[in-house]
Interface confidence: low
């Protein structure tokens, strides 16, 4: 029951997180005009990953895609890429995790398959969250380092007359949305990975496998790592010793490089 709850909660948290990452990527308020020196300005600028906007005191807002002869800076392209990769991985993770949910039965899908899918989606959510956090952090770092030299084109009025105003930009709402959303996706991914451990079919940790020694004694070895997890078992009896005449002490005391198969 706890496993189902952990898995379900992980899914919901990740779903909210990915929705937040999508929202942050689409938002225009990645950087907003710093109004510290001019709190009663007639125009307010804010910029996103895709376009730049200006809002006038009248309420009129105009947004434009970036037009630049130089091409957009590589760092902006990198942030865009990180956010898109985060969204894509998150979306695939959600798709996988829906089929992995314990409360949903699909045909005769085994628990081991669900465990694998849960782990896969969990890892995807973790990477997705990290991508979003990295993208937002890179943007924030650029804003901090270039805080004093950012400029904006301010459109004054419907006619589109333009004047250049030295404007400083500060963190926009999208950055905070991105950080929180990335964090939620990350937490959701961790929860899915935790749930995966509980979903793995339980097998006996000590599968006794006989190994024949030529002497009078018989040594028993546990099945090793593979037998203790649900992801494969050591079913074949493997001869560890070559049948040479050894004493019981020799067999049990000296570890061989073949001891763990």
């Amino acid at each position: 029951m706890a496993v189902t709850a952990c898995q379900g909660l992980g899914f919901v948290v990740s779903l909210i997180g990915i929705a937040g990452i999508i929202a942050a990527t689409c938002m225009d308020q990645w950087s907003t005009q710093d109004l510290y020196n001019n709190p009663v300005t007639a125009v307010f600028n804010y910029q996103g990953l895709w376009r730049s906007c200006v809002r006038e005191s009248s309420g009129f807002t105009e947004c434009r895609g970036y037009f630049t002869l130089l091409g957009l800076p590589a760092m902006l392209q990198a942030v865009r890429a990180l956010m898109i990769v985060g969204i894509v991985l998150g979306a695939i993770g959600l798709l996988v995790s829906i089929f992995a949910l314990k409360c949903i039965r699909i045909g005769s899908m085994e628990d081991s398959a669900k465990a694998n899918m849960t782990l896969t989606s969990g890892i995807m959510f973790i990477v997705s969250g990290l991508c979003a956090i990295a993208g937002v952090s890179v943007f924030a770092n650029m804003l901090v380092t270039n805080f004093w030299m950012s400029t904006a084109n301010m459109y004054t009025g419907m006619g589109g007359m333009v004047q250049t105003v030295q404007t400083r930009y500060t963190f926009g709402a999208a950055l905070f949305v991105g950080w929180v959303a990335g964090g939620l996706t990350l937490i959701g991914g961790v929860m899915m990975c935790i749930a995966c451990r509980g979903l793995a079919p339980e097998e006996t940790n000590y599968k006794a496998v006989s190994y024949h020694a030529s002497g009078h004694s018989v040594a028993y070895k546990p099945g090793g790592f593979k037998a203790s997890t649900g992801f494969g078992s050591n079913t074949k009896n493997k001869k560890i010793y070559d049948g040479g005449a050894r004493t019981e002490d020799e067999v049990q005391s000296y570890p061989s490089k073949h001891d763990y198969v």
Epitope: T68, L72, F139, N146, S150
Partner: nanobody
């Protein structure tokens, strides 16, 4: 701070020619200079531009008729407009871009010069 001053606008007949000039005064040399235009009730659009590397960019509607040229020493950009059409009527703005490492290039604009093509 970069100041841009345009000159050369005026009234011209269809098929005529006009040369617009833009002088940039300031300590910094721009990475790219361009001409944009805005017709009444329309959005501002790129006419022609040239980067520091010398690559040019023209609007489809002016290709073959307009030519942009740049003097890096004087920090000026000229737009030679031939075979003018009535649809070329607009306010022409000079633009300079400086890439400072910020996400968005610093963009500077002139006040604009009116070009009217009419018979």
């Amino acid at each position: 701070q970069l100041q841009l001053v345009e000159s050369g606008g005026g009234l011209v007949q269809p098929g005529g020619s006009l040369r617009l000039s833009c002088a940039a005064s300031g300590e910094i040399s721009s990475d790219a200079m361009a001409w944009y235009r805005q017709a009444p009730g329309k959005q501002r659009e790129l006419v022609a531009g040239m980067t520091r590397g010398g690559s040019t960019n023209y609007a489809d509607s002016v290709k073959g008729r307009f030519t942009i040229s740049r003097d890096f020493a004087k920090n000026t950009v000229d737009l030679q407009m031939n075979s003018l059409k009535p649809e070329d009527t607009a306010v022409y703005y000079c633009n300079a871009e400086i890439y400072t490492g910020t996400f968005y290039p610093r963009s500077y604009w002139g006040q604009g010069t009116q070009v009217t093509v009419s018979s």
